[in-house]
Interface confidence: medium
């Protein structure tokens, strides 16, 4: 028995009640006063949290009972107060005393993994002993009672690749794994309390372990030989065909690059399709069946990213042989020149040969040609490619002709090619000079001798290699016209001067002056031009601007050419 030092009359045992008792009334012990002689004169009372609901006292004997199942993990200690009263007087026999009921642990809680789900990633081919993940189980039981909360970990599933340290829950690799064979492992770890002894409770957890990829595989061509065909007419950049290598690795480790080997002509190239990792063989230069009908090239494939320590796995890169057959294409005719410039003098009779164009069939059969000409009705072409005139050409009408010659193969009229032919008509001196404009010339009645009446100039429709040079002269035939004289200024202009003082409008209202103009062509051409001079009433001034009858003659139509 235990006697409380402060409350000397109280006697009780240490009170323990096992948790999880299924009985509805469990006797815990007895509280009594040493003054109680057993004649039922005392009444015992229980106070505090749990009194009357969880714990009950027999008022007569002081026996204490637990009437509810207790859970140590919920509450491990109850502090209650006891009273003992004399029934006769209603007074306390002893001072109120505090006592403790301890709930003793049973192993009723299994270890639980609170951090689920467990997921880990570890590189494939990791060596034995590599740390993967640590799992931890918790046991709600009392760690100070036996081994109720002492946990041992055990691998239920995952051998022979993984192991677990029994006391720490650290999972390690115990055998190398190849992601390309299996990429995910499901490991089951069991945690047992009681250090795994009989009566132990257990809990399990699943650990999902993913192997991350390392670049331990080189790409290998699916086929050792590829045959492709390409038309000789295919433009640069044309895709000839696809080659494919496979790599058991994933992601960046499977990224590959293709290259062309043994292609001295540098006709082909390989680009990669990043989505499919296929190599696309493309044309880098034009091919010509007549020049070479097939090509044999070799392609190589290797990874883009290789770690130094994994380089040994990537020696002897995979190669494949590619045969490219060039298909003969019925090609259109080819002109000897990309364009032609021909010359012909103007004024030649129709049927004159301008020049010859020539096209040939690049194919082996060398088809004869047929030619067609468009762009002008002044020309025609025969089956030999000779261009002739169909009219006399006048440079002053057209100095250039832009013609198109079309050549078709006789055997296949669908095969057509065209070339531009530029015909230049060059000048011959076939145009005499003439007045550059129509002159309305006036002379005042009171004009003085030597006075300038008109400055004239000329034009010539001919083309001149050097600058035109014109010569002016008074026609020898114009004997009756001595009232005016002409002076050549030597600059392609001439001046008409009055050769007398005074004119009479009424007597001689109009003068016609015949002027000869010659060019400097070979041979020189001369024209006769008439200048009409009207006498004018200028009043007191000698300025033709004030002429009263100005323009009347020209308006009335007395103009003579």
């Amino acid at each position: 028995d235990y006697k409380d030092d402060d409350d000397k009359g109280w006697v009780w045992n240490q009170f323990f009640v096992p948790e999880e008792m299924n009985t509805t009334s469990h006797h815990i012990g007895q509280l009594r006063s040493d003054l109680d002689n057993g004649n039922n004169s005392f009444q015992y009372k229980l106070l505090g949290a749990g009194a009357g609901s969880t714990f009950i006292i027999d008022e007569r004997t002081g026996d204490i009972y637990a009437i509810q199942k207790l859970d140590r993990e919920e509450r491990s200690l109850y502090i209650l107060r006891a009273q003992v009263i004399d029934i006769a007087t209603g007074r306390a026999v002893e001072p109120e005393s505090e006592f403790v009921i301890k709930v003793s642990d049973i192993n009723d809680n299994e270890p639980r993994f609170l951090d689920e789900p467990y997921e880990a990633i570890v590189p494939e081919m990791s060596p034995e002993g590599t740390f993967v993940i640590k799992v931890t189980a918790n046991d709600a039981d009392d760690p100070s009672t036996g081994y109720h909360a002492r946990i041992l970990y055990n691998l239920e599933r995952g051998q022979p690749y993984f192991s677990v340290e029994p006391t720490t829950g650290v999972i390690r690799i115990s055998s190398k794994m190849d992601r390309e064979l299996q990429d995910t492992y499901c490991v089951i770890i069991q945690a047992k309390d009681m250090l795994g002894q009989p009566g132990a409770l257990s809990g399990t957890t699943t650990v999902s372990i993913k192997l991350s990829d390392i670049n331990d595989n080189k790409p290998i061509f699916k086929e050792s030989f590829y045959r492709f065909t390409i038309s000789e007419s295919a433009p640069i950049g044309t895709s000839i065909g696809k080659i494919m290598a496979y790599d058991d690795d994933i992601g960046e480790n499977a990224e590959m690059e293709y290259s062309i080997e043994d292609d001295d002509s540098k006709i082909f190239d390989i680009i990669i399709d990043n989505d499919t990792q296929e190599g696309i063989v493309i044309l880098k230069k034009k091919v010509d069946f007549e020049q070479q009908s097939y090509y044999g090239i070799r392609a190589k494939v290797k990874n883009c990213h290789v770690d130094e320590e994994l380089a040994p796995a990537h020696v002897n890169a995979s190669t494949t042989y590619i045969k490219v057959q060039v298909e003969d294409e019925d090609e259109p005719p080819v002109f000897l020149l990309p364009y032609y410039i021909l010359e012909i003098p103007e004024g030649k009779p129709y049927g004159t040969i301008v020049g010859t164009v020539s096209a040939t069939d690049p194919d082996r059969r060398q088809s004869p040609m047929r030619y067609y000409l468009t762009g002008s009705k002044m020309f025609d072409i025969n089956d030999n490619g000779t261009i002739i005139t169909t009219n006399m050409l006048d440079r002053e009408v057209s100095a250039w002709y832009n013609l198109t010659v079309t050549a078709t193969e006789t055997y296949n009229v669908q095969q057509i090619s065209s070339a531009h032919v530029y015909v230049q008509v060059f000048n011959i001196n076939d145009n005499a000079p003439e007045f550059s404009q129509f002159y309305e010339t006036y002379v005042c009645e009171n004009a003085e001798s030597g006075e300038i009446v008109q400055i004239i100039s000329a034009i010539d429709r001919d083309e001149s290699i050097e600058d035109h040079h014109f010569y002016f002269n008074h026609s020898l035939e114009d004997t009756n016209n001595s009232s005016f004289m002409l002076t050549d200024n030597q600059d392609n202009t001439a001046v008409i001067l009055s050769n007398r003082t005074g004119f009479n409008l009424k007597e001689e209202p109009v003068f016609y002056m015949i002027i000869l103009i010659a060019d400097n062509g070979i041979p020189s051409l001369t024209s006769t031009n008439t200048l009409t001079i009207q006498v004018c009433d200028c009043g007191d001034s000698r300025n033709t601007e004030t002429c009263a009858n100005k323009g009347l003659l020209f308006i009335m139509g007395f103009r003579t050419e």
Partner: antibody
Amino acid sequence: QVQLVQSGAEVKKPGASVKVSCKASGYTFTSYYMSWVRQAPGQGLEWMGIIHPSGGDTTYAQKFQGRVTMTRDTSTSTVYMELSSLRSEDTAVYYCARGGIKLWLHFDYWGQGTLVTVSS
Amino acid sequence: QSVLTQPPSASGTPGQRVTISCSGSRSNIGSNFVNWYQQLPGTAPKLLIYTNNQRPSGVPDRFSGSKSGTSASLAISGLQSEDEADYYCAVWDDSLNGWVFGGGTKLTVLG
């Protein structure tokens, strides 16, 4: 596990006495009260009294005062109920039941019952 | 004549909810804990509910007890055929200084 095993059926004449035993096992005998409850044929339950095996203290229902005696033998963990001056209306099944102190304690375990027939 | 009053009978079909009442006075239900017992035909009574609303282990949670003032009730939800039995309420009576039982209610599961 807790078990209460009662003695066999009895047939008694009016005026006689009957003593029914109840042997307890599976728990600390002296820590729990024992009550006696009877049930007449086709009738309800009727509480007769209680004994504390530790000190032998008893409390009897008013109706049976003077006619019933409850005793115990701690050495054999057995309680006894003796009913005297039997009448025909005492014909019933008599049960011992663990528990029954004031205020709280219920009857958590019951014996299988003993049929007492009072007949002339 | 019992100190505690119970209806003599009650019935329900499987799956239904049935309530059995127990009426007393201040000296019994009004002052003390109520217990309920189930007695299957030909067997000893069995503790069903103690201290008003507690269920011993092994008793299904379809059974529940409650107390209010001087009355108590037992509710059975999701009625099953094996629930067919007599049900008794019991409580300590301070005036009589002893245990009193209700007259019992015979529960019949129909159909």
